[in-house]
């Protein structure tokens, strides 16, 4: 490498991860790096060994900017086999965690295939079931074939998974079981010679599962009381433990300690060590440690002990003296900051009475009062009473709880009608919202207009999403407002605000909203203000009962905000079942400002057209079909007849006279008048009365004398009557004749 190249890790002269050399040869290793470095050697190589020499790092490389060091081991032996490492010194500028290079050197010796030989006395290897177990029969050459055997006859064959062979470490058993407990040996045959090194596995049944001290820390006592601490150690089945205590008075043996074993658990041991000090004093305060040892396992548990000369109580507000919550909350915790010893008796008062007696919803938890399912009844003054009778200590502290309520509009909770009410056109209307909330809500009225559009069948675009306007009594939006007022009233024992909007003249459809808000929330009630020019929003009319051959004229008018799909149907009863027959040739419905009109005209009716006619419309809000019925009875035709025949009549000249021709018939007969066989037309001085049934002649002249005939006619026939009208006081000429 040139001096320009940075060596992140030191570089060794021997490349690769391992190197095999023969025993008796000299090991020569050079390390080059960017900084000062040191060597780490196998435990079997002593730094004092005269055969070992290490030169301290000195400048080397191009421009002498690098550091080099050499390690020389003369006449290397089998037990010098191991890992040789060159690493940067931690004080150097290199911040790398693993700024080191290593090589594993095998010093091969045919006479010593194993680095360590245990022939007569097996080496003790501790094992824990379920954990990794290493039988450390490391070898001096990676080429040595080693077999693992268990006394007397078993061979443990490496499978690459549970049991593996590593020439640097030995046999690795991934999760040891009790089957590996006993005498194991590693065997290697080199040049026909069998070498054996022996290991005795010893199962460490020293699993400490848990250590606890009761009572839990911290332990508080008054001067003169007795301290009892129970330390429990839970272990696996065949595990022994040694339990000891460290505590402030240990030197003077202040405590008595007794031990016992709880054998009530089938799967483990529970060892108890109970420390007891009678009449504790200040010197007994401090840290108490229970120490549990089992083989190489060790666990400890601490607890702190406080000794007080006398009892005390200190109480403060944890939050503000005045606290707020909201009705409907699942729970609210009123909490005080209390420091006291010994534990005081606690009583909570609400408005001077014991809280827990007032309601089962009040629960005392430590120095807190928990209020379940908060209601307005929970507002009030809460006092915590704390007392330590034996010390004659008593303290109390009061907090005020305000229970806020989100606004509620009572008219919303009353089951509303399935479809909105209709307001008669031009009527005066009083709209009311009754509101409750804490703090007292502010109420505003709003108007959402419906945009007028006659081409629409109804105002289905008139929704709450429309732009809204805040109203005041002088507003000219929508309908003329007479007043907006508010008054307080007590309903069911609570103060409620009644807000009233008076509409002076119902003209414009839309939506009125009353909105109530306080700091907890907002609630709104929408009042659909649908104006109607139809009584009850649905009206059916029959022009007149038709006779055979006449036209039937029916009219249906519905409020367009409430109804749609208007149609006429004829109801017929067949076998006690009412059938709905649709009527063809219906006219198109016409839409007006407030209503939809559908007229039905049936020309030239016959008797068969008699029946129950119904106008059907669908309620937009309920989806229900509404029927309004009218009975139509087509009258049978009947030839005309006169109720009274005309009779001859004398009238004075210049007088007036009336001829009456009352006829009956179905359909109603047409009356025609004749004088001397000429049809009489209405003209000045001659007036035809209603339906032509009367003939009135003003200022009679002699020309009016003659034969008058009336004829009553309908499809069934005709009838007539005649009479002679004589005019008295005519001229002489007439007399002569």
């Amino acid at each position: 490498y040139g001096s320009g190249s940075k060596l992140k890790v030191p570089e060794l002269s021997l490349k690769g991860t391992q190197h095999v050399m023969q025993a008796g040869q000299t090991l020569f290793l050079k390390c080059r790096g960017e900084a000062a470095h040191s060597w780490s050697l196998p435990t079997t190589v002593s730094q004092e060994d005269k055969r070992l020499s290490i030169t301290p790092p000195s400048a080397c490389g191009r421009d002498n900017r690098q550091f080099c060091s050499t390690l020389t081991l003369d006449t290397a032996q089998a037990n010098h086999t191991g890992l040789y490492t060159c690493r940067y010194l931690p004080t150097s500028t290199s911040k790398k965690k693993k700024a080191e290079s290593s090589i594993y050197i095998f010093v091969s010796d045919a006479g010593s295939p194993f680095i360590e030989m245990h022939t007569d006395i097996p080496k003790l290897v501790h094992m824990t079931e379920g954990r990794q177990l290493i039988i450390p029969c490391r070898v001096t050459s990676p080429n040595v074939t080693v077999t693992l055997k268990k006394f007397p006859f078993d061979t443990l064959t490496p499978d690459g998974q549970r049991i593996t062979w590593d020439s640097r470490r030995g046999f690795i058993i991934a999760n040891a079981t009790y089957k590996e407990i006993g005498l194991l040996n590693c065997e290697a045959t080199v040049n026909g010679h069998l070498y054996q090194t022996n290991y005795l596995t010893h199962r460490q049944t020293n699993t400490i599962l848990d250590v606890q001290i009761r009572p839990p820390s911290p332990v508080r006592l008054l001067h003169g009381q007795t301290l009892v601490l129970n330390c429990t150690a839970t272990t696996e089945l065949n595990t022994r433990v040694q339990m000891s205590w460290n505590y402030p008075g240990k030197a003077t043996k202040r405590a008595s300690i007794r031990q016992r074993i709880d054998r009530s658990h089938s799967h483990n041991n529970v060892f108890h060590s109970v420390l007891k000090i009678n009449n504790v004093e200040s010197r007994d305060k401090g840290l108490y440690t229970c120490r549990v040892k089992s083989g190489s396992s060790f666990q400890s548990f601490n607890t702190s002990v406080h000794v007080y000369e006398k009892g005390f109580i200190s109480v403060k507000h944890r939050k503000q003296p005045v606290q707020e919550t909201t009705a409907g909350r699942r729970s609210y915790r009123l909490s005080m900051k209390v420091k006291a010893f010994p534990s005081p008796e606690i009583v909570w008062l609400k408005d001077g009475s014991p809280a827990t007696l007032k309601s089962a919803r009040y629960l005392v938890h430590g120095y807190s009062l928990i209020i379940k399912d908060v209601t307005t009844e929970d507002a009030g003054d809460y006092t915590i009473l704390l007392g330590i009778k034996q010390s004659r200590l008593f303290k109390n502290l009061t907090a005020t709880l305000i229970v806020n309520v989100k606004p509620q509009i009572y008219e919303k909770s009353v089951s509303s009608l399935p479809s909105p009410p209709l307001y008669p056109l031009g009527s005066r209307q009083v709209l009311t919202c009754t509101v409750y909330g804490i703090p007292r809500p502010t109420i505003t009225w709003l108007w959402h207009p419906c945009h007028h559009n006659h081409s629409k069948e109804r105002y289905d675009f008139c929704t709450e999403n429309e732009e809204s306007f805040i109203l005041d009594p002088s507003s000219n939006l929508g309908n003329r407002i007479e007043s907006i007022s508010q008054r307080m009233t007590v309903i069911e024992g609570t103060n409620k605000t009644v807000s009233t909007l008076v509409v002076a003249d119902s003209q414009t459809p839309g939506i009125y909203s009353c909105r109530a808000f306080n700091k907890i929330g907002t609630v709104e009630r929408n009042i659909k203000f649908y104006v109607t020019d139809v009584p009850n929003g649905f009206h059916v009319s029959l022009e007149k009962m038709p006779a055979e051959g006449e036209d039937l004229k029916l009219s249906c008018v519905v409020n367009k905000f409430l109804y749609r799909d208007i149609t006429w149907i004829l109801l017929r009863t067949v076998n006690n079942r009412t059938m709905h027959h649709s009527i063809s040739k219906q006219k198109m419905a016409t839409t007006q400002d407030y209503s939809i009109t559908l007229n039905l005209v049936i020309k030239n009716v016959s008797l068969e057209d008699s029946g129950t006619y119904a106008c059907r419309a669908r309620n937009i809000y309920t989806g229900e079909d509404i029927l309004r019925k009218t009975e139509v009875l087509v009258r049978d035709s009947e030839a005309p007849h006169l109720l009274q025949n005309l009779s001859d009549y004398e009238v004075s000249i210049s007088g007036s006279t009336t001829l009456d021709c009352q006829a009956r018939g179905v359909p109603a007969p047409q009356i025609t008048w004749f004088k001397n066989n000429h049809k009489i037309q209405q003209e000045p001085g001659i007036i035809l009365g209603p339906g032509n049934s009367t003939l009135f002649i003003e200022r009679v002249t002699e020309e009016d004398e003659g034969v008058y005939r009336c004829r009553a006619t309908n499809q069934k026939g005709a009838v007539e009557s005649a009479a002679y009208l004589t005019v008295q006081g005519t001229s002489d000429k007439s007399n002569l004749e």
Partner: antibody, heavy 115, light 112 residues
Framework: QVQLKESGPGLVRPSETLSLTCTVS????????LSWVRRPSGKGPEWLCR???????TYNSAFKSRLTISRDTSKDQVFLKMNSLQTDDTGTYYC?????????WGQGVMVTVSS | DIVMTQTPVSMSVSLGGQVSISCRSS???????????LSWYIQKPSQSPQLLIY???NRVSGISDRFSGSGSGTDFTLKINKIEPDDLGVYYC?????????FGSGTKLEIK
């Protein structure tokens, strides 16, 4: 090599006392607990009692009044005494090393209770 | 006492086949330190019982991986794959969670 071997009479008269011995090797009674388990004919095994490694004892409450378990660690032996035997006590009696589970069992001794 | 119920009482299976033995306890076998002490044993003809599986699913060293244990709480299963002639015998489950230690009444496995 862990081994357990039970010994005792094969035939016991009703109302008499059964005495069984379990001799162990390959482990120490000071390190491991040991249990007695029996298997009545045609039934599943029944645990009788446990001798803990430290000499403590635990009995199955169903048999407690009739059982005594003890040991001689110097001889690596555990003893079971069961009194007031009835015919339904007939079965094979095993001693078993008790290390959370019964990991090693003796070959068992068949005990018949009959007059 | 915890009652251990084994099903079936006996079963006949072909060599190479697979079996499942069920064991149900009358109450949970999870102990206070979270372990479940449920074991499976085999008693081959004219032999003493031999531990196969401990703590529900841990196979004893030297036991073939054809044997597997599973389950939790109160329901446990022993599965044996690729049945061999040496597998015949009576299989027992046992609990070591609570005194008295109890066993199932056994499932006899026969080879067809």
């Amino acid at each position: 090599q862990v081994q357990l071997k039970e010994s005792g009479p094969g035939l016991v008269r009703p109302s008499e006392t059964l005495s069984l011995t379990c001799t162990v090797s390959g482990f120490s009674l000071s390190d491991y607990s040991l249990s007695w388990v029996r298997r009545p004919s045609g039934k599943g095994p029944e645990w009788l009692c446990r001798l803990w490694f430290d000499g403590d004892t635990t009995y199955n409450s169903a048999f407690k009044s009739r059982l005594t378990i003890s040991r001689d660690t110097s001889k690596d032996q555990v003893f079971l005494k069961m009194n007031s035997l009835q015919t339904d006590d007939t079965g094979t009696y095993y001693c078993t090393r008790d290390d959370r589970d019964f990991d090693y069992w003796g070959q068992g001794v068949m005990v018949t209770v009959s007059s | 006492d915890i009652v251990m119920t084994q099903t079936p009482v006996s079963m006949s299976v072909s060599l190479g086949g697979q079996v499942s033995i069920s064991c149900r306890s009358s109450q949970s076998l999870v102990n206070n330190n979270g372990n479940t002490y449920l074991s499976w044993y085999i008693q081959k003809p004219s032999q003493s019982p031999q531990l196969l599986i401990y703590k529900v699913s841990n196979r004893v060293s030297g036991i073939s991986d054809r044997f597997s244990g599973s389950g939790s709480g109160t329901d446990f299963t022993l599965k044996i794959n690729k049945i061999e002639p040496d597998d015949l015998g009576v299989y027992y489950c046992g609990q070591n969670t609570q005194y008295p230690l109890t066993f199932g009444s056994g499932t006899k496995l026969e080879i067809k």
